[in-house]
Protein backbone atom coordinates (compact mmCIF):
# COMPACT_ATOMS: atom_id res chain seq x y z
CA UNK A 1 0.00 0.00 0.00
CA UNK A 2 1.07 3.20 -0.69
CA UNK A 3 1.63 5.43 2.60
CA UNK A 4 -0.97 6.70 4.55
CA UNK A 5 -3.68 4.89 2.54
CA UNK A 6 -6.63 3.05 3.99
CA UNK A 7 -9.33 1.62 2.78
CA UNK A 8 -11.08 3.74 0.71
CA UNK A 9 -8.20 6.72 -0.18
CA UNK A 10 -4.90 6.40 -0.51
CA UNK A 11 -2.75 9.62 0.12
CA UNK A 12 0.91 10.46 -0.86
CA UNK A 13 0.88 8.40 -3.55
CA UNK A 14 2.77 8.46 -6.48
CA UNK A 15 1.47 9.37 -10.19
CA UNK A 16 -0.96 7.48 -12.49
CA UNK A 17 -0.39 4.85 -14.90
CA UNK A 18 -0.89 6.06 -18.64
CA UNK A 19 -4.79 7.08 -19.85
CA UNK A 20 -5.24 7.28 -16.00
CA UNK A 21 -6.15 10.82 -14.81
CA UNK A 22 -4.92 11.53 -11.04
CA UNK A 23 -7.74 13.60 -9.05
CA UNK A 24 -7.72 13.83 -5.63
CA UNK A 25 -5.55 10.61 -4.18
CA UNK A 26 -7.33 8.40 -6.72
CA UNK A 27 -6.65 7.40 -10.10
CA UNK A 28 -9.84 7.28 -12.49
CA UNK A 29 -10.02 6.05 -15.85
CA UNK A 30 -12.53 6.87 -18.56
CA UNK A 31 -13.03 4.32 -20.67
CA UNK A 32 -13.26 5.59 -24.85
CA UNK A 33 -15.22 2.20 -26.01
CA UNK A 34 -18.20 0.88 -24.33
CA UNK A 35 -19.27 -2.22 -22.62
CA UNK A 36 -22.00 -3.89 -20.44
CA UNK A 37 -21.39 -3.77 -16.91
CA UNK A 38 -20.12 -7.31 -16.57
CA UNK A 39 -17.28 -6.64 -18.96
CA UNK A 40 -16.62 -3.36 -17.46
CA UNK A 41 -15.82 -4.77 -14.08
CA UNK A 42 -13.69 -7.46 -15.73
CA UNK A 43 -11.59 -4.46 -17.09
CA UNK A 44 -11.22 -2.65 -14.16
CA UNK A 45 -10.29 -5.55 -11.66
CA UNK A 46 -7.49 -6.67 -14.36
CA UNK A 47 -6.20 -3.74 -14.46
CA UNK A 48 -5.63 -3.77 -10.38
CA UNK A 49 -8.81 -1.36 -10.01
CA UNK A 50 -12.70 -1.73 -9.26
CA UNK A 51 -15.59 0.30 -10.94
CA UNK A 52 -15.91 3.51 -9.72
CA UNK A 53 -17.59 3.15 -5.83
CA UNK A 54 -17.75 7.14 -4.90
CA UNK A 55 -17.41 7.78 -1.06
CA UNK A 56 -19.60 10.91 -0.61
CA UNK A 57 -21.60 13.46 -2.86
CA UNK A 58 -17.88 15.60 -2.92
CA UNK A 59 -16.39 13.43 -4.94
CA UNK A 60 -19.14 12.14 -7.11
CA UNK A 61 -19.80 16.26 -7.85
CA UNK A 62 -15.89 16.70 -8.80
CA UNK A 63 -15.76 13.71 -11.24
CA UNK A 64 -19.16 14.71 -13.02
CA UNK A 65 -17.31 17.94 -14.24
CA UNK A 66 -15.96 15.61 -16.74
CA UNK A 67 -18.82 13.65 -17.60
CA UNK A 68 -21.29 14.50 -20.09
CA UNK A 69 -24.58 13.24 -20.83
CA UNK A 70 -23.29 9.60 -21.95
CA UNK A 71 -23.72 7.52 -19.39
CA UNK A 72 -20.93 5.65 -17.59
CA UNK A 73 -21.20 2.35 -15.57
CA UNK A 74 -19.62 2.88 -12.06
CA UNK A 75 -19.95 -0.24 -9.35
CA UNK A 76 -23.55 0.05 -8.35
CA UNK A 77 -25.86 -2.63 -8.33
CA UNK A 78 -28.98 -3.49 -7.00
CA UNK A 79 -29.26 -6.48 -4.81
CA UNK A 80 -32.10 -6.13 -2.69
CA UNK A 81 -31.25 -2.35 -2.04
CA UNK A 82 -28.48 -0.15 -4.23
CA UNK A 83 -25.01 -1.16 -2.92
CA UNK A 84 -21.68 -0.46 -4.43
CA UNK A 85 -19.24 -3.32 -4.70
CA UNK A 86 -17.46 -2.43 -1.55
CA UNK A 87 -20.73 -3.53 -0.37
CA UNK A 88 -21.76 0.01 1.60
CA UNK A 89 -25.17 1.17 0.65
CA UNK A 90 -26.26 4.34 -1.56
CA UNK A 91 -27.08 6.44 1.08
CA UNK A 92 -25.60 9.84 -0.09
CA UNK A 93 -27.40 10.43 -3.07
CA UNK A 94 -30.50 9.01 -5.15
CA UNK A 95 -30.46 6.82 -8.21
CA UNK A 96 -33.22 7.03 -10.87
CA UNK A 97 -34.70 4.26 -11.30
CA UNK A 98 -38.29 3.10 -12.37
CA UNK A 99 -37.69 -0.47 -14.00
CA UNK A 100 -37.42 -3.68 -12.09
CA UNK A 101 -35.30 -5.27 -14.54
CA UNK A 102 -32.67 -2.41 -13.97
CA UNK A 103 -30.29 -3.33 -11.34
CA UNK A 104 -27.06 -1.49 -12.20
CA UNK A 105 -25.84 1.91 -11.85
CA UNK A 106 -24.09 4.41 -14.31
CA UNK A 107 -23.35 8.07 -13.62
CA UNK A 108 -23.42 11.35 -16.00
CA UNK A 109 -23.05 14.62 -15.26
CA UNK A 110 -26.78 15.01 -14.18
CA UNK A 111 -26.25 12.29 -11.48
CA UNK A 112 -26.96 8.78 -10.95
CA UNK A 113 -29.04 6.04 -13.03
CA UNK A 114 -30.47 2.60 -12.79
CA UNK A 115 -30.13 0.60 -16.40
CA UNK A 116 -30.01 -3.07 -17.40
CA UNK A 117 -26.87 -4.59 -17.22
CA UNK A 118 -26.02 -5.78 -20.89
CA UNK A 119 -26.28 -2.25 -21.83
CA UNK A 120 -22.94 -1.20 -23.77
CA UNK A 121 -21.87 1.92 -21.94
CA UNK A 122 -18.53 3.68 -20.93
CA UNK A 123 -17.36 2.95 -17.70
CA UNK A 124 -14.77 4.33 -14.72
CA UNK A 125 -12.17 2.71 -13.46
CA UNK A 126 -11.00 3.47 -10.02
CA UNK A 127 -7.35 2.88 -8.18
CA UNK A 128 -4.79 3.71 -6.32
CA UNK A 129 -1.89 5.11 -7.82
CA UNK A 130 0.81 1.95 -8.99
CA UNK A 131 -1.56 -1.28 -8.12
CA UNK A 132 -2.05 -0.23 -4.41
CA UNK A 133 -4.40 -2.09 -3.47
CA UNK A 134 -6.68 -0.41 -1.46
CA UNK A 135 -9.20 -0.61 -4.85
CA UNK A 136 -12.17 1.78 -3.39
CA UNK B 1 -46.13 4.36 -9.43
CA UNK B 2 -46.41 3.94 -13.40
CA UNK B 3 -49.48 3.78 -15.08
CA UNK B 4 -50.50 4.47 -18.77
CA UNK B 5 -53.69 4.81 -20.06
CA UNK B 6 -54.70 4.63 -24.04
CA UNK B 7 -57.51 6.82 -25.40
CA UNK B 8 -58.67 7.21 -29.35
CA UNK B 9 -61.69 6.71 -30.77
CA UNK B 10 -63.82 3.54 -30.74
CA UNK B 11 -64.92 3.83 -34.21
CA UNK B 12 -63.21 4.52 -37.26
CA UNK B 13 -64.32 4.10 -40.82
CA UNK B 14 -62.21 2.34 -43.60
CA UNK B 15 -59.89 4.39 -45.31
CA UNK B 16 -59.81 7.17 -42.46
CA UNK B 17 -56.88 7.84 -40.05
CA UNK B 18 -56.69 6.13 -36.28
CA UNK B 19 -54.87 8.49 -33.88
CA UNK B 20 -54.21 6.70 -30.70
CA UNK B 21 -52.60 8.54 -27.32
CA UNK B 22 -50.98 6.84 -24.46
CA UNK B 23 -50.77 9.27 -21.29
CA UNK B 24 -47.91 8.24 -18.81
CA UNK B 25 -47.24 8.64 -15.41
CA UNK B 26 -45.01 7.62 -12.51
CA UNK B 27 -41.86 7.59 -14.79
CA UNK B 28 -40.78 10.25 -17.83
CA UNK B 29 -40.30 9.74 -21.49
CA UNK B 30 -37.38 11.15 -21.57
CA UNK B 31 -35.40 8.85 -19.10
CA UNK B 32 -32.61 6.53 -20.29
CA UNK B 33 -32.80 3.55 -20.84
CA UNK B 34 -37.02 4.00 -21.02
CA UNK B 35 -39.31 4.19 -24.29
CA UNK B 36 -43.45 3.58 -25.31
CA UNK B 37 -44.74 0.35 -27.58
CA UNK B 38 -47.59 -0.07 -28.71
CA UNK B 39 -48.77 -3.60 -29.25
CA UNK B 40 -52.60 -4.71 -30.28
CA UNK B 41 -54.88 -8.24 -30.20
CA UNK B 42 -57.20 -8.32 -32.76
CA UNK B 43 -60.91 -10.29 -31.04
CA UNK B 44 -59.67 -13.83 -29.84
CA UNK B 45 -56.47 -13.18 -31.53
CA UNK B 46 -52.56 -13.22 -30.21
CA UNK B 47 -50.67 -9.84 -29.64
CA UNK B 48 -48.72 -8.02 -32.70
CA UNK B 49 -45.93 -5.46 -31.95
CA UNK B 50 -46.72 -2.55 -33.92
CA UNK B 51 -44.15 0.36 -33.00
CA UNK B 52 -42.35 1.71 -30.30
CA UNK B 53 -40.41 5.00 -29.02
CA UNK B 54 -37.09 5.48 -26.95
CA UNK B 55 -36.05 8.14 -24.40
CA UNK B 56 -34.39 10.07 -27.14
CA UNK B 57 -37.01 10.28 -29.92
CA UNK B 58 -35.31 6.56 -31.57
CA UNK B 59 -38.64 5.04 -33.32
CA UNK B 60 -39.10 1.30 -34.83
CA UNK B 61 -42.19 -0.04 -36.51
CA UNK B 62 -43.22 -3.28 -38.01
CA UNK B 63 -42.03 -3.37 -41.20
CA UNK B 64 -44.69 -4.96 -42.74
CA UNK B 65 -47.36 -1.71 -41.03
CA UNK B 66 -44.20 0.75 -41.67
CA UNK B 67 -45.86 2.78 -44.03
CA UNK B 68 -48.89 3.28 -42.52
CA UNK B 69 -47.69 3.72 -38.96
CA UNK B 70 -46.38 7.04 -37.01
CA UNK B 71 -45.54 6.82 -33.43
CA UNK B 72 -44.31 10.30 -31.71
CA UNK B 73 -44.09 11.90 -28.13
CA UNK B 74 -44.69 14.91 -26.28
CA UNK B 75 -42.16 14.64 -23.17
CA UNK B 76 -43.89 17.97 -21.60
CA UNK B 77 -47.26 15.97 -21.91
CA UNK B 78 -46.30 12.75 -20.96
CA UNK B 79 -47.56 11.85 -24.21
CA UNK B 80 -47.10 9.00 -26.75
CA UNK B 81 -48.88 9.47 -30.16
CA UNK B 82 -49.25 6.46 -32.40
CA UNK B 83 -51.06 6.98 -36.20
CA UNK B 84 -52.34 4.34 -38.33
CA UNK B 85 -53.30 5.32 -41.95
CA UNK B 86 -56.06 3.67 -44.40
CA UNK B 87 -57.44 1.94 -41.60
CA UNK B 88 -59.13 -1.47 -42.92
CA UNK B 89 -61.82 -4.13 -40.87
CA UNK B 90 -58.73 -6.15 -40.28
CA UNK B 91 -57.22 -3.22 -37.88
CA UNK B 92 -60.17 -3.76 -35.77
CA UNK B 93 -58.40 -4.93 -32.11
CA UNK B 94 -57.61 -3.74 -28.62
CA UNK B 95 -54.25 -1.36 -28.77
CA UNK B 96 -52.16 -1.51 -25.88
CA UNK B 97 -49.64 1.04 -25.12
CA UNK B 98 -46.79 -0.71 -22.53
CA UNK B 99 -43.31 0.67 -21.35
CA UNK B 100 -40.42 -0.34 -22.92
CA UNK B 101 -37.08 -1.12 -20.97
CA UNK B 102 -33.87 -0.57 -23.22
CA UNK B 103 -31.31 -4.01 -22.69
CA UNK B 104 -28.93 -2.22 -25.26
CA UNK B 105 -30.98 -2.63 -28.47
CA UNK B 106 -33.13 -0.01 -30.02
CA UNK B 107 -35.03 -2.86 -32.54
CA UNK B 108 -35.56 -5.67 -30.33
CA UNK B 109 -34.71 -7.17 -26.72
CA UNK B 110 -36.46 -5.31 -24.19
CA UNK B 111 -39.25 -5.75 -21.83
CA UNK B 112 -42.56 -4.55 -21.79
CA UNK B 113 -43.05 -3.99 -18.03
CA UNK B 114 -46.30 -1.49 -17.32
CA UNK B 115 -49.41 -1.91 -19.79
CA UNK B 116 -52.20 0.51 -20.18
CA UNK B 117 -55.57 -1.37 -20.03
CA UNK B 118 -56.24 -1.09 -23.51
CA UNK B 119 -58.82 0.76 -25.61
CA UNK B 120 -60.81 -1.23 -28.32
CA UNK B 121 -60.87 0.15 -31.76
CA UNK B 122 -63.54 -1.05 -34.46
CA UNK B 123 -63.27 -0.28 -37.76
CA UNK B 124 -66.40 -0.28 -39.61
CA UNK B 125 -68.36 1.39 -42.03
CA UNK C 1 -40.04 -13.74 -38.76
CA UNK C 2 -39.36 -16.37 -35.27
CA UNK C 3 -42.78 -18.19 -34.70
CA UNK C 4 -43.30 -18.97 -31.31
CA UNK C 5 -45.95 -21.79 -30.91
CA UNK C 6 -47.10 -22.95 -27.42
CA UNK C 7 -48.57 -25.72 -26.16
CA UNK C 8 -50.86 -26.65 -25.57
CA UNK C 9 -53.63 -24.14 -26.11
CA UNK C 10 -55.79 -24.56 -23.38
CA UNK C 11 -55.30 -26.51 -20.06
CA UNK C 12 -57.47 -26.90 -17.19
CA UNK C 13 -56.13 -27.53 -13.69
CA UNK C 14 -57.38 -28.49 -10.45
CA UNK C 15 -56.37 -25.80 -7.39
CA UNK C 16 -53.32 -26.70 -5.52
CA UNK C 17 -51.78 -29.36 -8.58
CA UNK C 18 -49.00 -28.11 -10.89
CA UNK C 19 -49.51 -26.60 -14.70
CA UNK C 20 -46.66 -26.73 -17.47
CA UNK C 21 -46.79 -24.37 -20.56
CA UNK C 22 -44.29 -25.57 -23.64
CA UNK C 23 -43.08 -22.31 -25.87
CA UNK C 24 -40.88 -23.35 -28.76
CA UNK C 25 -39.29 -20.84 -31.28
CA UNK C 26 -38.91 -21.48 -34.98
CA UNK C 27 -35.03 -20.49 -34.13
CA UNK C 28 -32.82 -20.39 -31.61
CA UNK C 29 -33.37 -16.80 -29.54
CA UNK C 30 -30.00 -16.95 -27.90
CA UNK C 31 -28.80 -13.66 -28.61
CA UNK C 32 -25.34 -12.40 -29.80
CA UNK C 33 -24.45 -10.74 -26.54
CA UNK C 34 -25.40 -14.08 -24.97
CA UNK C 35 -28.49 -13.50 -23.35
CA UNK C 36 -32.10 -15.18 -24.08
CA UNK C 37 -34.78 -12.43 -24.21
CA UNK C 38 -37.75 -14.76 -23.71
CA UNK C 39 -40.21 -13.46 -21.69
CA UNK C 40 -43.77 -14.91 -20.24
CA UNK C 41 -47.06 -12.18 -19.87
CA UNK C 42 -50.36 -13.69 -18.54
CA UNK C 43 -53.56 -11.68 -19.21
CA UNK C 44 -55.85 -12.14 -17.24
CA UNK C 45 -59.88 -12.20 -18.00
CA UNK C 46 -60.91 -8.61 -18.96
CA UNK C 47 -57.08 -6.90 -18.28
CA UNK C 48 -53.78 -6.25 -20.24
CA UNK C 49 -50.92 -8.13 -20.32
CA UNK C 50 -48.87 -8.24 -17.10
CA UNK C 51 -44.90 -9.44 -17.19
CA UNK C 52 -44.45 -12.56 -15.01
CA UNK C 53 -40.78 -13.85 -16.27
CA UNK C 54 -38.05 -11.73 -18.58
CA UNK C 55 -35.01 -13.16 -19.84
CA UNK C 56 -35.94 -16.72 -19.33
CA UNK C 57 -36.21 -17.86 -15.49
CA UNK C 58 -36.44 -13.75 -13.71
CA UNK C 59 -39.35 -13.22 -11.91
CA UNK C 60 -40.67 -9.80 -12.38
CA UNK C 61 -41.52 -7.46 -9.22
CA UNK C 62 -44.18 -8.92 -6.83
CA UNK C 63 -44.83 -12.17 -8.96
CA UNK C 64 -45.21 -14.86 -7.07
CA UNK C 65 -42.69 -17.98 -6.60
CA UNK C 66 -45.29 -20.53 -7.81
CA UNK C 67 -43.99 -18.88 -11.21
CA UNK C 68 -40.62 -20.43 -12.55
CA UNK C 69 -39.59 -20.37 -16.10
CA UNK C 70 -36.66 -22.38 -17.68
CA UNK C 71 -35.47 -23.55 -21.06
CA UNK C 72 -32.38 -22.52 -23.52
CA UNK C 73 -32.46 -22.14 -27.21
CA UNK C 74 -35.32 -23.15 -28.85
CA UNK C 75 -37.83 -24.32 -26.01
CA UNK C 76 -38.75 -22.88 -23.25
CA UNK C 77 -41.19 -23.99 -20.16
CA UNK C 78 -43.25 -21.66 -17.24
CA UNK C 79 -44.26 -23.67 -14.60
CA UNK C 80 -47.03 -23.28 -11.98
CA UNK C 81 -46.18 -25.27 -8.78
CA UNK C 82 -49.49 -24.64 -7.60
CA UNK C 83 -52.36 -23.39 -9.70
CA UNK C 84 -54.45 -20.65 -7.35
CA UNK C 85 -57.67 -19.12 -8.89
CA UNK C 86 -56.15 -15.97 -8.99
CA UNK C 87 -54.27 -17.56 -12.08
CA UNK C 88 -57.04 -18.20 -14.57
CA UNK C 89 -56.19 -16.12 -17.83
CA UNK C 90 -54.48 -16.41 -20.79
CA UNK C 91 -50.18 -17.23 -20.89
CA UNK C 92 -48.41 -15.46 -24.15
CA UNK C 93 -44.29 -16.17 -24.26
CA UNK C 94 -42.57 -13.58 -25.98
CA UNK C 95 -39.75 -13.61 -27.87
CA UNK C 96 -37.27 -10.34 -27.85
CA UNK C 97 -34.02 -11.29 -29.17
CA UNK C 98 -34.72 -11.12 -32.91
CA UNK C 99 -36.01 -8.14 -35.70
CA UNK C 100 -39.00 -8.53 -35.73
CA UNK C 101 -40.30 -9.23 -31.78
CA UNK C 102 -43.15 -11.97 -31.75
CA UNK C 103 -45.35 -13.69 -29.14
CA UNK C 104 -46.89 -17.15 -29.07
CA UNK C 105 -50.14 -17.45 -29.75
CA UNK C 106 -51.53 -18.13 -26.15
CA UNK C 107 -52.23 -20.86 -24.00
CA UNK C 108 -55.79 -20.61 -21.90
CA UNK C 109 -55.61 -21.94 -18.13
CA UNK C 110 -58.85 -22.55 -16.75
CA UNK C 111 -59.63 -23.91 -13.45
CA UNK C 112 -61.19 -27.41 -12.82
Known amino acids: LCQGSNYSTCASCPSCPDRWMKYGNHCYYFSVEEKDWNSSLEFCLARDSHLLVITDNQEMSLLQVFLSEAFCWIGLRNNSGWRWEDGSPLNFSRISSNSFVQTCGAINKNGLQASSCEVPLHWVCKKCPFADQALF | QVTLRESGPALVKPTQTLTLTCTVS??????????VGWIRQPPGKALEWLAH???????WYELALKSRLTISKDTSKNQVVLTITNMDPVDTATYYC?????????????????WGQGTTVTVSS | DVVMTQTPLSLSVTPGQPASISCKSS???????????LEWYLQKPGQSPQLLIYKVSNRFSGVPDRFSGSGSGTDFTLKISRVEAEDVGVYYC?????????FGQGTKLEIK
Open chain 2, 26 to 35: GFSLSTFGMG
Open chain 3, 27 to 37: QSIVHSNAHTY
Open chain 2, 98 to 114: ARVIYYGSRSAYYSMDY
Open chain 2, 53 to 59: IWWDDDK
Open chain 3, 94 to 102: FQGSHVPVT
